[in-house]
Structure formats: C-alpha cells, structure tokens
C-alpha cells in the first residue's frame, strides 16, 4: 500500500488540513490550564496532570494512551529545615541570612507547594569559609583564577554567576579545584534586559528571584542510581556512594539582592578584567575573603536537602501507521517544572497537545500517517532528564531498529524575534523546505515566508542566503536518543535577539516568576509565535511520518562533516612541533569524508531515480536514510561518558548545552600543552582520529549500494 | 484599597510587656519587608525594627535591642512588635511601615503607614 491509498486524501491537502486545523486560541489554553499549580517531578500533581493528558489524549483520537512509571533517584528541599546561607561574625553569629523562599507574584500568595529555590541533589552540609568569586566558574574561568592569579580555590566556598555554561559544569569545575562550597547567583548583568522593568511590570527578573535547576554531572546516564538500564520493580539500584553523576559540595542559589549583600564586602584580588565584572555595583573582587573591615567575617552554607527514590510518570500516545507501523517518528516534552513552568515546560507541553489534537482530528476523519507517531509526555526532566532516558533505555531494543526520528518540544519560546532550529544535518533540507511554506509571525514579514524571516534575522555565518541551524548539544530530552541511540533528532523554538539581548537564556528561567501571564502579557499576546512553533514541530513530525521517501538528506552531512573536520585539523595545527614529533595525520579522516562525500552524491543520485512503486526497493532506501544516523554510534562511547556514543557531536565536556563536533578529537587536543606525559596525550589524539576516520568511514559504506 | 491598621498600644508599667499587631489589608504581606516607627512626643520619627519578607533577617535599633521582637504570620497577614522590659523612653506613638522593595533584603524607604497606636510608658 502506498500512503495515498492509506490516506484517502492527497499528500498535499494532509500537510495543509493538518497545519490548518492548529489553532492559537488553543495553546493559549492549554497553557492557562497546565500552568495555574506547580507540577514538580514526584509529586501528587504532576501524577494528576499525567493523568489528564492521558486522558485528553485518548479523547483526541490516539490508538492507545499509556503511562510509564519508574522509580528514580530525585532531591527535595527539607520542608522544616530550609536552605540558606550566612554571613557570620567572629563568634559565629549569623549577621546575614539569604532568603528563605521567592516573594510569590501576584494571585499566586495563597499557592502551596511551591518549592523554595534550591539546587537539586546537593548534599547537605554546613561548611563555612572565606568567598571566592569565579565569574561564570567555566573551564577558562578558573584556569585564569589558578593558573595566571596563583588564587587557590582550596578549602574556600566560591561564589558563581549563573550564565554561559550548564550549572551542573560549573558545581563539576569548582569541585575539581577543591572549593568545599558554591553559591550561585543570577547578576543582573546576565539575567536583567536593559529597558525592561522587573517582573510583575516586564520580563525582567526581579532582585528576590531565583534560578533552580540540577547540579548533575550524569553524561546521558539517566537514573544516577540505574545507569544503562530502566529503574523498574526489579531494578537493582547501586548506593547513593556509587549513583552517577551526584555533587560532592553543598550547592546553593541566590537572586542579586542577595548576591549584593555577599559580593559588596569582598576584598583580595581585583577582577581581572572588564569580563569578571557583572551589573552590581560591587567592586567584583575576586577574593578570598571579605575586605579590611570585614575580614573576621566567614560565609557559612546551610544545605539539608535530601534524595529520595520517587516514583515518576511518563505519557506515552500512539498514532498507528498505515502502511509502515513497525517505524517510528516521536514528538517529545517534558510535563515537568520547577514551579509553574509558563515558558519551561508548558508552553512546549501546550503546542505538542494541540499537535495532537490536530493528528486526532485527521484520523477520525479517516486519515492515518504512513508511520507510527509516537507522542511523549515526558517526566524529571529538569532533574536530569530521567524520564526520557529511562523510557529509551526500557526501549532500546526497539528504537534502534524501528526509531526513524524524534523532534523535542520543550520550551515553546525563549524569546520573540526569531526561530532557532538545533537538528541533525540530516534534517537541514526538511526544515528548509518547511519554512518556506508557512507564514513568517514578525512584524514587518507580513505576507512572507517563515524560511525568509528567519534568514534576514539569523543568518547562516557560512551560506548567504540560508538560516542558521546550530549542532544539537544537551540539557534536554533528546539527548538519549540523538547521543546515545542515534536517532536523527531536532528542535525549534522562537527565540530571542542574541545579538542585542546578552542574557543567558531568558530572564526568569527557572524561578517562581515564569507564569502563564509572563507568556500572555510578554512574550506572545496573540499566541502567534507559539502557533509557528507549532507549525515547525508539527510540520517536521508530519514530513516524517507520511512522506514516501524519509526526507533526510545524506549530502548534507557530507558537507558539515568536512567543516568539522577542517575545525578539529586547524585545532591540531596549533601544535605543529607536536603533530611533527608524534607523527599526527588527519588523512585517514579527510579521506573517509572525502569517500563519504562521493557516496552521499551516488546515493542521492539513486534516491531520485528508483522505481517508488516497488515496496521493498523503498523500504531498502528508507532504511539506510534511517540507519545512517545509527552509524555514527560508537558502541563503545567516548572517552569515561560511555553514554555518549555519537561521534560525530556530544555535549561539550565544558558545557552540557553546547555541542562539540568530533568530540572524542576535541577533548583529547583539549589543554594538550599541559599534559604531564605529551606522548601518552597526543597518542590519544591518534587514537581518536582513528576512531572518527573508521566511523566516518563506515557509515559512508551503509550508504553504498547493498550489493 | 491598601491599608495599614496598627492595635495594640495602651499604658503600661515599666518593666512590663505589650504586643502590637499591624493588620495589612489591599496587598499581600508575604512579598514585603515590614517595619516599625515610632515618634515620642515632640520629637522626631525614629526607626525601630524591620523584618525581611520571608523572615530570615531581622534588624533592630540599638535602643530596642535585646527587648523588642518583630514577628509576622503572613497566612493571618498580620505584622507584631513584642516589646519587653519596656522603659519611659518607649513612650511613643508606634507606626508599622511597608518597605517600598518587593523582596528587599535590608531596610530601605517606606511606601505605605499607619495611623499608628500610642503606647505609653508610665508609672
């Protein structure tokens, strides 16, 4: 059967009933609704919110509608002994205490259960001592603190801006320079938009807010206490000693009020430069200690946070295919929040519930895709990305063999001026092609196409004419299955002007501010950026579920695969007395690329030639599109995060958001010069050049013809 | 309409104790740091106590220390000043203020006050 004959309605007229029949009016709702309680992992209502969308699901049309549940490793504030930090004076009386919860914004004082910022799975301790401050606390950050300042972080508690790089490197960078304590802290610098009043007024955070967020190191490993396999009834769990990925320092974050009344008294080491130096008026001193005056005085953290097995649900929708059930396209968000969760994650979660109303409204009239589509609802995102990986570690078996492409849907908006797109190469032409046929939302691109907006707005730093599309790093639910299974995986979302805006991520990310009327009052009045997300997200699952031919193209790859390697080789150059010495060549990869490169061409040559009609000739082409992504796995993974298999992108070791190419090649050229044993480093690199020129290699080869 | 309603004043022997209380209708106490003024006859506006928001700070006037304690019950809405071992110096008239900073984490301006209640001091 071809999908037609499944369909009943022509190609062209699915994609458009199914774009049409998504409405503003919709996600605005499903907003309001998903946003007006906390819906923290582990909790009472998170499980009642997994249980409506089951429902609702089933009400909109899906085959079936399940909930997964596992038993995971999650961290909670202690409810009558809170987390603060104090300054204290020489008898040890606390002069300063930081505050105890977020004041709650409008129509939300009476709410319960809002948890008080807190940084997820710290440990508890009381640890006291003299402030240090490492501006962002990044890899670059501390060598210019240990290495060029000769300031030891040893037995100090140091205190970080928020920004730049994912928390959980910055705890991980401050542990292995020896700090027993870290106070993390949003300057305004990073989190307060020039122009733009605080929230209730704007969208600007306010001094008492606060970020949450997890301190985790887990490298894709899921459950610390699972690692590899899914927490279930019969789990055998290691001990909290041996869980993955867990801080051995208290950690604690603070708002800029705060952050002040701790920064405003340091003396030691002047910053720098102008780049240690944030929006406060401080001096930004480095440290250790507090000036003159107040050099008696200790900073002293309180932290009885506790980790606890939780149980945790994820929802889990199936639309049957038609013609192909046994492939899988998968739409996933985390359901999740820290607290009311208005842009993270429930604007993501109200745009995949109108998707799958719209999917719904199709098959009752009839309609089936050609593949399965997979809906996902997922849970303990924000506390490490639990329920997706437990999910796909439960199912791994039949998403390698069957797991055709998964699209993320967290966060519908971080911004209003332009689309982001992070994807696979593989999906560079699908999101071209798409944007060129739906409508730009900008002011000013009225009547234009989505493709052209984004184009004038972001533009690609190497093809004139073309969007940017950035490389997929980490923080979120679909790192297991793009970093460890392998399957081709994307997300869009609006977002920001990065050139004017130069904040971190968005202003009240993560605190008890980010409410459905910051989204309705702000960001997205009308709902219009959140409907052309919808647009994207819904676009690119309809594509690869019901197109004949998987539209992924293999010569895309080709090409980035040759920017990346003429950026790990000029890295390399930087070290030419070495490469000479250690006899380093990069041919074996510019060969295997230059091989995949005329393969990708023959193969694309065959893909618009054969004959469409013949179902297993199909069915062999479709296959080796969806096998290609599978051949970039190593089995083996990289380097100690064995749950970081792709070799040709992880996250970078220095920052789980971003994405490194050739990442094994990068961390083993990373501060080569200095290496203890130069020849044992850069025989390393060796090895790894290897391993990308045998992958590269052999994923050009399941692109050959089969016989 | 935002208020303050100060109660609890009245004479009182020194050495002995009262509780003020400071009911705040219009807005929601638990967003504002809260403080206490008072005004002796014929003098001048004198600062007394302020407590942060979530009640993790608490400063207090020398001439108060040790002797006064400003609590809050933000369910009830409601501010108090407890004021032992009381002296003729305490005699005044004792307005609770709202800190004008949502959040604010030391003392700063007052926005909104009382009509204030007298407590006087007196053998």
């Known amino acids: 059967k071809s999908s037609n004959e499944a369909t009943n309605i022509t190609p062209k007229h699915n994609m458009k009933a199914f774009l049409d029949e998504l409405k503003a009016e919709n996600i605005k709702k499903f907003l309001y609704n998903f946003t007006q309680i906390p819906h923290l992992a582990g909790t009472e209502q998170n499980f009642q919110l997994a249980k409506q969308i089951q429902s609702q699901w089933k009400e909109f049309g899906l085959d079936s509608v399940e909930l997964a549940h596992y038993d995971v490793l999650l961290s909670y504030p202690n409810k009558t002994h809170p987390n603060y930090i104090s300054i204290i004076n020489e008898d040890g009386n606390e002069i300063f205490n930081t505050s105890l919860f977020e004041p709650p914004p409008p129509g939300y004082e009476n709410v319960s259960d809002i948890v008080p910022p807190f940084s997820a799975f710290s440990p508890q301790g009381m640890p006291e001592g003299d402030l240090v401050y490492v501006n962002y606390a990044r890899t670059e950050d501390f060598f210019k603190l240990e290495r060029d300042m000769k300031i030891n972080c040893s037995g100090k508690i140091v205190i970080a801006r928020y920004g730049k790089v994912f928390r959980g490197n910055k705890v991980k960078n401050a542990q292995l320079a020896g700090a027993k304590g870290v106070i993390l802290y949003s300057d305004p610098a990073d989190y307060f938009a020039p122009g733009v009043k605080s929230y209730p007024d704007g969208w600007n955070l306010p001094g008492g807010g606060v970020q949450r967020g997890n301190i985790l190191n887990l490298n894709g490993a899921g459950d610390p206490l699972t690692p590899g396999y899914p927490a279930n009834e019969y789990a055998y769990r290691r001990g909290i000693a041996e869980a993955v990925g867990l801080p051995s320092i208290p950690v604690h974050p603070i708002g800029y009020y705060d952050a002040q009344k701790l920064l405003e008294k340091m003396g030691g080491s002047a910053p720098p430069d102008s780049s240690w130096r944030g929006s406060l008026k401080v001096p930004y001193n480095v440290g250790p200690g507090f000036t003159g005056n107040f050099s008696t005085q200790k900073v002293k953290m309180h932290i009885h946070s506790t980790n606890e097995v939780t149980r945790i649900y994820n929802v889990i929708g199936t639309l049957r295919g038609a013609v192909e059930p046994d492939r899988y396209v998968i739409l996933g968000g985390h359901r999740d929040s820290w607290v009311f969760g208005g842009i993270d994650p429930q604007s993501g979660a109200a745009v995949v519930h109108e998707i799958v109303r719209s999917f719904g409204t199709l098959k009752k009239e009839g309609w089936r895709p050609r593949r399965t589509i997979l809906f996902a609802s997922w849970d303990a995102e924000e506390f490490g990305l639990l329920g997706s990986t437990e999910w796909a570690e439960e199912n791994s078996r039949l998403l390698q063999e069957r797991g055709v492409a998964y699209i993320n849907a967290d966060s519908s908006i971080e911004g209003n001026y332009t689309l982001r797109v992070d994807c696979t190469p593989l999906m560079y032409s699908l999101v071209h092609n798409l944007t060129k046929e739906l409508k730009s939302p900008d002011e000013g691109f009225e009547g234009k196409s989505l493709y052209e907006s984004w184009t004038k707005k972001s533009p690609s730093p190497e093809f004139s004419g073309m969007p940017r599309i950035s490389k997929l790093g980490s923080g979120n639910d679909f790192e297991v299955f793009f970093q460890r299974l392998g399957i081709a995986s994307g997300r869009a979302r609006y977002t920001k002007n990065w050139e004017t805006n130069k904040f971190s991520g968005y202003p009240l990310y993560h605190s008890v501010y980010e409410t459905y009327e910051l989204v309705e009052k702000f960001y997205d009045p009308m709902f219009k950026y959140h409907l052309t997300v919808a647009q994207v997200r819904g676009g690119m699952v309809f594509e690869l579920a019901n197109s004949i031919v998987l539209p992924f193209d293999c010569r895309d790859y080709a090409v980035v695969l040759r920017k990346y390697a003429d950026k790990i080789y000029s890295i390399s150059m930087k070290h030419p007395q070495e490469m000479k010495t250690y006899s380093v060549s990069f041919d074996s990869l510019f060969s295997a690329v230059k091989n995949f490169t005329e393969i990708a061409s023959k193969f694309s040559e065959r893909l618009q030639d054969f004959d469409k009609s013949n179902p297993i000739v199909l069915r062999m082409m479709n296959d080796q599109l969806m096998f290609l992504e599978r051949a970039f796995i190593d089995p083996l993974g990289l380097p100690d995060r064995p749950f970081y298999r792709h070799v040709i992108y992880a996250p970078s070791s220095h920052n789980k958001y971003a994405g490194e190419s050739f990442p094994g090649i990068y961390d083993a050229l990373f501060d080569i010069e200095s290496k203890v044993d130069p020849s044992k480093a850069w025989g390393e690199v060796k090895r790894q050049i290897y391993v990308a020129a045998f992958t590269v290699q052999a994923a050009a080869e399941t692109l050959s013809e089969v016989a | 309409e935002v208020q303050l309603v100060e109660s609890g004043g009245g004479v009182v022997q020194p050495g002995r104790s009262l509780r003020l209380s400071c009911a705040a209708s219009?807005?929601?106490?638990?967003?504002?740091?809260m403080h206490w003024v008072r005004q002796a006859p014929g003098k001048g506006l004198e600062w007394v106590a302020f407590m942060t928001y979530d009640g993790s700070n608490r400063y207090y006037a020398d001439s108060v220390k040790g002797r006064f304690t400003i609590s809050r019950d933000n369910s009830k809405n409601t501010l108090y000043l407890q004021m032992n071992s009381l002296r003729d110096e305490d005699t005044a008239l004792y307005y609770c203020?709202?800190?004008?900073?949502?959040?604010?984490?030391?003392?700063?301006?007052?926005?909104?006050w009382g009509q204030g209640t007298m407590v006087t001091v007196s053998s």
């Open positions: 219009g807005f929601p106490l638990i967003s504002y740091g």
């Open positions: 203020a709202r800190d004008r900073i949502v959040g604010g984490r030391v003392p700063d301006a007052f926005d909104i």
